[in-house]
């Protein structure tokens, strides 16, 4: 049992009758060089902005208690499309991806993804073409070069094509996604499949013998039972954001990945609210060091599948689904007919090394406590590039369990919870319009009292 995430994004393109606007061919950019640190950082910030836009909309329209998606997977699918997009369609894709006017987005993204945490990260992309559909050679070459997307011809027999696609998806995600497509539309001309399989290990594993049944607080009134992983002295970077008040912690994976969890101290929050003033810089403040921390984190299994057509339309990509300019792919008109995305995430105790090994050196420092026992948001970042690989929200980690009414004596409300933060030092460094970062001071460690 490991921490695993396997997202898959599918772009379905169908035939579009010629018509609409004429266009000039976009000039090719000089994109072959390795990305500079500045480009990488700029891309990480852009990806974070795209993540916030995309996830806010997904959360607004979803009724699921838990959500997960891979913005990187969606961005890769869209940037693959951008390889063949022209004029307004290309401009829109760049704007939605916050990529400015740089033509090198597909090259940058694919290059950075090639270098992502070896062993933890497997990127697979494949293109399925309608039998005999004329695709431009240049697009085929670039697709293969950048995304490893060797074109595969559809047979035209629905059952066979479906079986082949689902088999490939299953293999590409190491069995995590078994039945991705249940049907293929008759007029499918081009399928872009983009699968990312993430398999992370905590840098400091949790001791399974400490995992026990505990309460996860859904709101002021109700809890659900969860399997809560625990560590007594876990080396953790954490800090407090103000307005709204959010506890943030960075749990390191091996292979330069981080699980960043955001726990709002109030129950009344929505994803859009939290993400509104959240930027890459807010989540990566300088001068926040690892501390030995008493940690409680629920074991998780999340799976979410969605069609992103409506969401991407709301983001400003309506054109893709009505009359896009994709003449870099083919002179015959194409239209995107579907954007399917699926991710699964599993969090358990396994890791690389025992936490005790690191905590010995830190044992003289005062101890704090970080409990993830109320609704939270999370990101998985690749630390070298700063790219957000996944984003998710957990309202109820055990939706099949019956809710339990809190007993008054053991359910401190927000008032008590916030009272326990009173001794926490207040910083005044501003991030964005009204987001304050409050780093914990070296000497000053209150017990971070969450509901027990």
């Amino acid at each position: 049992n490991q921490e695993q995430v396997s997202p898959l994004t599918l772009l379905k393109l169908g035939n579009q009758e010629p018509g609409g606007q004429t266009a000039l061919k976009s000039p090719p950019g000089v994109c072959s060089r390795d990305p500079t640190p500045e480009q990488t950082h700029r891309l990480a910030r852009a990806m974070m902005a795209f993540t916030a836009d995309l996830f806010s909309l997904v959360a607004q329209t979803s009724t699921c208690p838990n959500l997960i998606l891979s913005p990187l997977s969606v961005a890769l699918a869209l940037s693959h499309l951008a390889l063949g997009a022209q004029n307004h369609t290309l401009q829109r894709l760049q704007q939605v991806l916050h990529a400015g006017s740089g033509p090198c987005l597909p090259h940058l993204l694919s290059r950075l993804c090639q270098d992502l945490g070896p062993g933890a990260f497997r990127l697979a992309a494949r293109m399925y073409l309608q039998k005999g559909f004329p695709i431009k050679e240049d697009f085929l070459e670039q697709s293969e070069q950048l995304f490893g997307a060797k074109p595969v011809s559809l047979t035209g027999k629905q059952e066979d094509d479906l079986a082949n696609i689902n088999q490939w998806v299953k293999e590409a995600t190491e069995g995590k996604i078994q039945e991705f497509l249940s049907g293929l539309p008759e007029d499918t001309v081009l399928l872009l499949l983009n699968a990312i399989h993430f398999q992370g290990f905590w840098r400091n594993k949790f001791d399974p013998s400490l995992t026990q049944r505990d309460s996860f607080h859904l709101d002021e009134q109700f809890t659900v039972p969860v399997e809560m992983m625990q560590a007594r002295t876990y080396p953790l970077r954490w800090f407090l954001l103000e307005q709204p008040e959010i506890q943030v912690a960075h749990f390191p994976f091996k292979n330069n990945m981080s699980f960043v969890v955001l726990v709002p101290t109030h129950f009344e929050w929505n994803v859009s609210q939290v993400l509104a003033n959240l930027s890459w810089d807010t989540l990566h403040p300088p001068l926040v060091w690892e501390r030995p921390t008493k940690v409680r984190l629920p074991k998780l299994y999340l799976k979410h599948q969605m069609d992103l057509v409506a969401t991407l339309s709301q983001l400003g990509l309506q054109e893709l689904f009505q009359a896009p300019d994709l003449r870099g792919i083919s002179e015959q008109s194409l239209v995107v007919s579907g954007v399917q995305h699926q991710s699964t995430l599993e969090l358990s105790e396994v890791g690389v090394e025992a936490a005790a090994a690191t905590s010995i050196a830190m044992s003289r420092m005062s101890l704090s406590s970080f409990s993830v026992n109320r609704p939270f948001l999370f990101f998985i970042f690749e630390d070298t590039t700063g790219l957000p690989l996944f984003v998710g929200s957990v309202r109820n980690p055990n939706p099949s369990a019956p809710r339990e009414l809190k007993e008054q004596q053991d359910s401190p409300g927000n008032k008590d919870f916030l009272q326990s933060l009173k001794g926490f030092p207040r910083g005044d460094k501003l991030f964005g319009p009204d987001l304050k970062l409050v780093p914990p001071m070296e000497e000053d460690y209150p017990q971070f009292g969450s509901p027990k």
Partner: antibody, heavy 119, light 107 residues
Amino acid sequence: QIQLVQSGAEVKKPGASVKISCKASGYTFTNYGMNWVRQAPGQGLEWMGWINTKSGEPTYAEEFKGRFTFTLDTSTSTAYLEIRSLRSDDTAVYFCARWVPGTYAMDYWGQGTTVTVSS
Amino acid sequence: DIQMTQSPSSLSASVGDRVTITCRASGNIHNYLAWYQQKQGKSPQLLVYNAKTLASGVPSRFSGSGSGTDFTLTISSLQPEDFGSHYCQHFWTTPWTFGGGTKLEIK
């Protein structure tokens, strides 16, 4: 030449339904999205939403979700707007307008259909 | 949702005058803005799209400018047929809202 021709004026009682048509000619119907716009007497223009003429998928502005439905008949190049449970504040002129991706504008408009809701 | 604020709401001017109508978006809409003219009892007509491109058949006295959040429609020398209401509309994320309109009247 390109034309959007809408159905005639309607007078309805509160609680009734109405279905307005917008017939397109002079271009390939499925290449351009169709918008619906409302204009109450003496007021400005209100964007109600649009329908993807290729997939048939509608997008509604928040205040037009529920009682309003956009549909298509691609065989006759016609878009429809249906309003259910009519109220007096639905009294307005309703326009259909063609959306052009790439230029991002509504370049051709129907002549408008006046709907009067009165008891 | 992006709100569009148009000013002024009404304007009296004489034939030959230079007239400027402004439209402000509550968020960055890049150059995805259109201007329309509507005469009493008629359908709106497209004047300008993509903030500054003149629609076909529109006289060159009309011009559009701006990008991001602030946009302007200018009529360099007002003609009798230019009177009526003028509306801006954004095309960034849905809903594609209109401005409140500017009623241009003869002085």
